[in-house]
Interface confidence: medium
């Protein structure tokens, strides 16, 4: 449906509050270094213009596309060249190339300070101006996560304000706020990683990759829905994500609201679990639908083998409509197996497709494909065995110890990767233990495999910015669904030339003593990576000795009266003992 003025259409559909929030997110995701007040000015300008267009759609400029209007605003920023360098060259391009250019300059790891929540300061800011506080949250998250799912960020901003509404009246603000903020932080980071994977799927592997992922996920969630229904939901959902990933946040939020309405209007044919979600207001409704628990599997489903292995017409079905046939295989398999990870289901579909490609070219195709389900078994066994081994190790070592084991494992596999990235990725991988190993058996595989997909995508995104390892590039680009097995299969890199020992990396100061525990852990883990880059073949025993010496050194100096003097004297001794231990 075409509208005379796209901006007026979206303003009317979304309402002023959501419109302003989404425009703020869009600008913050593009111009990640600009101060908040600068963005507020841009948002207000565009909002006033939108109101003009609502009043008169024939007003000059109202017919322009949203990309044109957004891009024109961005290109007005005075400090564009100084702050963003060659991003300013985008302004010389025409749409749609200009928007593509802005998108390509989004920075997945912008150099921005860590957000440290101070309850009293935050409560003062909240009480002073709730609207500004809401906007500041959108801005701070959006600039750090340039692909964050915009309508979902509006949901989290409302939740965030709700936490302050509750806690700023409490006697002990910190005790009320900090655990709630930490819980939210975890959820926000996971949401960011999920959307980053969706966008990477579209950008690197095409929308077909996201559609396949969505077919599996929605078939698991809505096993009573028929394939036709699931296909419609997947098509609409893919459009929503394509828009958000492409920076079309107003269209994305509008279409997401339409999809939520459709799902709720048709919940009888989709899922029995949607009732509660559908009674909520818009943002909560969409969030709730996205997180809704899996519906029960319908009774008396025929065995998969009937249609996909026993039927003599499998090759006819496959060859005459490949996507529809493979889509139905994925749908039927997924709705029967809520206990499988989406990535595993996609591997099964890929292997099934490969089997048909091979079998349908033979003289007796049926004899060839009739045993296909036996061939698929290993794809389920492999992650199950891996999960068992890793969860056993996690239970033995605890989260911190497990993270360190993963640091050793991954630094040996890909020692060329930057130390901060290896630390970040290994720490995240270690958290999978805490997150998933405690879950019941039926939830372990989807929890681990799908969480690992998010973390490995983060590694791929960071590595793409500065590629240093052919092995990482290969695992990241060859196959989206096989990324995790590819990384698992990597062996220690025998071609790696060890780094020279750098004393600077093992020089510490008194500031380490006042760091929060997490920061202290990161310091130690950074040292561990550097040790391995220097001595990749160091034994577990040697590493243990060095790390124990390091902990003793830090503990000793942090307990000393003159901490800085202690670090100055004991530091060089630590360097010597480390080199000796590793000799």
């Amino acid at each position: 449906d075409t509208h005379k003025s796209e901006i007026a259409h979206r303003f009317k559909d979304l309402g002023e509050e959501h419109f302003k929030g989404l425009v703020l997110i869009a600008f913050s995701q593009y111009l990640q270094q600009c101060p908040f007040d600068e963005h507020v000015k841009l948002v207000n300008e565009l909002t006033e213009f939108a109101k003009t267009c609502v009043a008169d759609e024939s007003h000059a400029g109202c017919e322009k596309s949203l990309h044109t209007l957004f891009g024109d605003e961005l290109c007005k920023v005075a400090s564009l060249r100084e702050t963003y360098g060659d991003m300013a060259d985008c302004c010389e391009k025409q749409e749609p190339e200009r928007n593509e250019c802005f998108l390509s300059h989004k920075d997945d790891s912008p150099d921005l300070p860590k957000l440290k929540p101070d309850p009293n300061t935050l409560c003062d800011e909240f009480k002073a101006d709730e609207k500004k506080f809401w906007g500041k949250y959108l801005y701070e998250i959006a600039r750090r996560h340039p692909y964050f799912y915009a309508p979902e960020l509006l949901y989290y901003a409302n939740k965030y304000n709700g936490v302050f509404q509750e806690c700023c009246q409490a006697e002990d603000k910190g005790a009320c706020l900090l655990p709630k903020i930490e819980t939210m932080r975890e959820k926000v980071l996971a949401s960011s990683a999920r959307q980053r994977l969706r966008c990477a799927s579209i950008q690197k592997f095409g929308e077909r990759a996201l559609k396949a992922w969505s077919v599996a996920r929605l078939s698991q969630k809505f096993p009573k829905a028929e394939f036709v229904e699931v296909t419609k939901l997947v098509t609409d959902l893919t459009k929503v994500h394509k828009e958000c990933c492409h920076g079309d946040l107003l269209e994305c939020a509008d279409d997401r609201a339409d999809l939520a309405k459709y799902i709720c209007d048709n919940q009888d044919t989709i899922s029995s679990k949607l009732k509660e979600c559908c009674d909520k207001p818009l943002l909560e409704k969409s969030h709730c639908i996205a997180e809704v628990e899996k519906d029960a599997i319908p009774e008396n489903l025929p065995p998969l083998t009937a249609d996909f292995a026993e039927d003599k017409d499998v090759c006819k079905n496959y060859q005459e409509a490949k996507d529809a046939f493979l889509g139905s295989f994925l749908y039927e398999y997924s709705r029967r197996h809520p206990e499988y990870a989406v990535s595993v289901l996609l591997r099964l579909a890929k292997e099934y497709e490969a089997t048909l490609e091979e079998c349908c070219a033979k003289d007796d195709p049926h004899a060839c494909y009739s045993t296909v389900f036996d061939k698929l078994k290993h794809l389920v066994d492999e992650p199950q065995n891996l999960i068992k081994q890793n969860c056993d190790q996690f239970e033995k070592l605890g989260e911190y110890g497990f993270q360190n084991a993963l640091i050793v494992r991954y630094t040996r596999k890909v020692p060329q990767v930057s130390t901060p990235t290896l630390v970040e990725v290994s720490r995240s991988l270690g958290k999978v233990g805490t997150r998933c190993c405690t879950k019941p058996e039926s939830e372990r595989m989807p929890c681990t495999e799908d969480y690992l997909s998010l973390i490995l995508n983060r590694l791929c995104v960071l590595h793409e910015k500065t590629p240093v390892s052919e092995k990482v590039t290969k695992c990241c680009t060859e196959s989206l669904v096989n990324r995790r097995p590819c990384f698992s299969a990597l062996t220690p890199d025998e071609t790696y030339v060890p780094k020279a020992f750098d004393e600077k990396l093992f020089t510490f100061h008194a500031d380490i003593c006042t760091l929060p525990d997490t920061e202290k852990q990161i310091k130690k883990q950074t040292a561990l990576v550097e040790l391995l880059k220097h001595k990749p073949k160091a034994t577990e025993e040697q590493l243990k000795t060095v790390m124990e010496n390091f902990v003793a050194f830090v503990d000793k100096c942090c307990a000393a009266d003159d901490k800085e003097a202690c670090f100055a004297v004991e530091g060089p001794k630590l360097v010597v003992s480390t080199q000796t231990a590793l000799a």
């Epitope: 829905a225 028929e226 394939f227 036709v228 229904e229 296909t231 025929p302 009937a306 249609d307 039927d311 003599k312 017409d313 006819k316 079905n317 005459e320 409509a321 529809a324 046939f325 889509g327 139905s328």
Partner: nanobody, 126 residues
Framework: EVQLLESGGGLVQPGGSLRLSCAAS????????VAWFRQAPGKGREFVAG????????YYADSVKGRFTISRDNSKNTLYLQMNSLRPEDTAVYYC???????????????????WGQGTLVTVSS
Amino acid sequence: EVQLLESGGGLVQPGGSLRLSCAASGRYIDETAVAWFRQAPGKGREFVAGIGGGVDITYYADSVKGRFTISRDNSKNTLYLQMNSLRPEDTAVYYCAARPGRPLITSKVADLYPYWGQGTLVTVSS
């Protein structure tokens, strides 16, 4: 739910033709894998012909290939079976069956079809 209602059966001489219809309600027929089965006296249900949901891929039993044609009219929400060169061994009750939500798989296994019409009798005799 899908309701199916067959019509068009009757007595016909060998070599003659008949056209069976199956009117569907409660579901768009183009979204549904639909098939014709038949059951001769004292025998089990036998697959005759089928058409995929969403994709017009047709399937026939070897015994009717070249003589029978399955088709559907989406605007009328109706399935058809055009039967030419009829033989005495084609005598049976003909049933229309549906598997909703199927993109194209038309299995020949009767048990996989949840919805059935009440059947229409076709007698081929001189």
